[in-house]
């Protein structure tokens, strides 16, 4: 029978190259059965993952999957780094792989990098 464990589908070594000053949505795909778990985002600081408080988050529902979204409105240079989502399910904590944001500061860069340059990162 199908497993009813909560699963977080962030791919290992995933990353996003984004611009400061523009909005971005970081999605954590969540699979669950009956009750939606409590999900949080944290940002890695060395080996510690610091829980993000007072941030704009929301849920998006698709057919067989829900997405817990961390909103960046807009992205800031300090948002550069690695993030992890975690779910609290039946008193257990399930952690995702980390996903990394590479933030380009468009004010310090001479111009926005081209799509080719971004693809080569």
């Amino acid at each position: 029978k199908e497993s009813c464990d909560v699963q977080l589908y962030i791919k290992r070594q995933s990353y996003h190259s984004i611009f400061a000053g523009d909005p971005f949505k970081l999605e954590c795909p969540v699979k669950y059965c009956a009750h939606r778990p409590q999900v949080t985002w944290c940002k890695l600081n060395g080996t510690t993952c610091v829980k993000l408080e007072g941030r704009h988050t929301s849920w998006k529902q698709e057919k067989n999957l829900s997405f817990f979204i961390l909103h960046f409105e807009p992205v800031l240079p300090s948002d550069n780094g690695s993030y992890r989502c975690s779910a609290n399910f039946l008193s257990a904590i399930i952690e995702s792989h980390s996903t990394t944001l590479y933030v380009t500061d468009v004010k310090s860069a001479s111009e926005r990098p081209s799509k080719d340059e971004m693809a080569s990162r």
Partner: antibody, heavy 120, light 106 residues
Framework: QVQLKESGPGLVAPSQSLSITCTVS????????VHWVRQSPGKGLEWLGV???????SYNPAPMSRLSISKDNSKSQVFLKMNSLQTDDTAMYYC??????????????WGQGTSVTVSS | QIVLSQSPAILSASPGEKVTMTCRAS?????MHWYQQKPGSSPKPWIY???NLASGVPARFSGSGSGTSYSLTISRMEAEDAATYYC?????????FGGGTKLEIK
């Protein structure tokens, strides 16, 4: 230097639409966001929405269905369109530049505002 | 949406007096901005990100706070400080303003 200047119709009839143009100078719309904020005696300051540098928009969910923000980078202009105006949309409408520092975002330069009265 | 409640609504102070106004948020926010507005003018940035004074703001102004409680303080009131001060949060859409504190000179 950084400047933003709003131009609007002044008077709008109820149920009609409002169009305001914000013309900016001293910065590029591809690097900075431009926000729309209104101020009415009854509601105080209310953030309406923003045109982000990359061309995406974010809106205040309350008046969102009536709002549309667009821009023309080459003309350094940002446009606000609001449909189905009612008397409580009477306000001063400001366009405002948004800027980020390392770890925060704020609205720094404000236009002088354009007064909009909704009346028949 | 995050509601910002400013108190007091009206504040009267004598020159040289210490002034403190507060802004309380209905939910925790990362930081608070403050704007000053005088009659007939647009709002001006006054304090960024809780405690950073905007360019040209006198050093007698300061800001502090965290979570749901923030404040703006003037160490010694001067006549030119008479204005309405608005707090503003940029943590969650819609990005809201407080109702303002009108500061008057006695």
């Amino acid at each position: 230097q950084v400047q933003l200047k709003e131009s609007g119709p002044g008077l709008v009839a109820p149920s009609q639409s409002l169009s305001i143009t914000c013309t900016v100078s001293g910065f590029s719309l591809t690097t900075y966001g431009v926000h729309w904020v209104r101020q009415s005696p009854g509601k105080g300051l209310e953030w309406l929405g923003v045109m982000w540098p990359g061309g995406r928009t974010s809106y205040n969910p309350a008046p969102m269905s009536r709002l549309s923000i667009s821009k023309d980078n080459s003309k350094s202009q940002v446009f606000l369109k609001m449909n189905s105006l009612q008397t409580d949309d009477t306000a001063m409408y400001y366009c405002v530049r948004g800027d980020y520092e390392y770890d925060y975002y704020a609205m720094d330069y404000w236009g002088q505002g354009t007064s909009v009265t909704v009346s028949s | 949406q995050i509601v910002l409640s400013q108190s007091p609504a009206i504040l009267s102070a004598s020159p040289g007096e210490k002034v403190t106004m507060t802004c309380r948020a209905s939910s925790s926010v990362s930081y608070m901005h403050w704007y000053q507005q005088k009659p007939g003018s647009s709002p001006k940035p006054w304090i960024y990100a809780t405690s950073n004074l905007a360019s040209g703001v006198p050093a007698r102004f300061s800001g502090s706070g965290s979570g749901t409680s923030y404040s703006l303080t003037i160490s010694r009131m001067e006549a030119e400080d008479a204005a309405t001060y608005y707090c503003h949060q940029w943590s969650s859409n819609p990005y809201t303003f407080g109702g303002g504190t009108k500061l008057e000179i006695k």
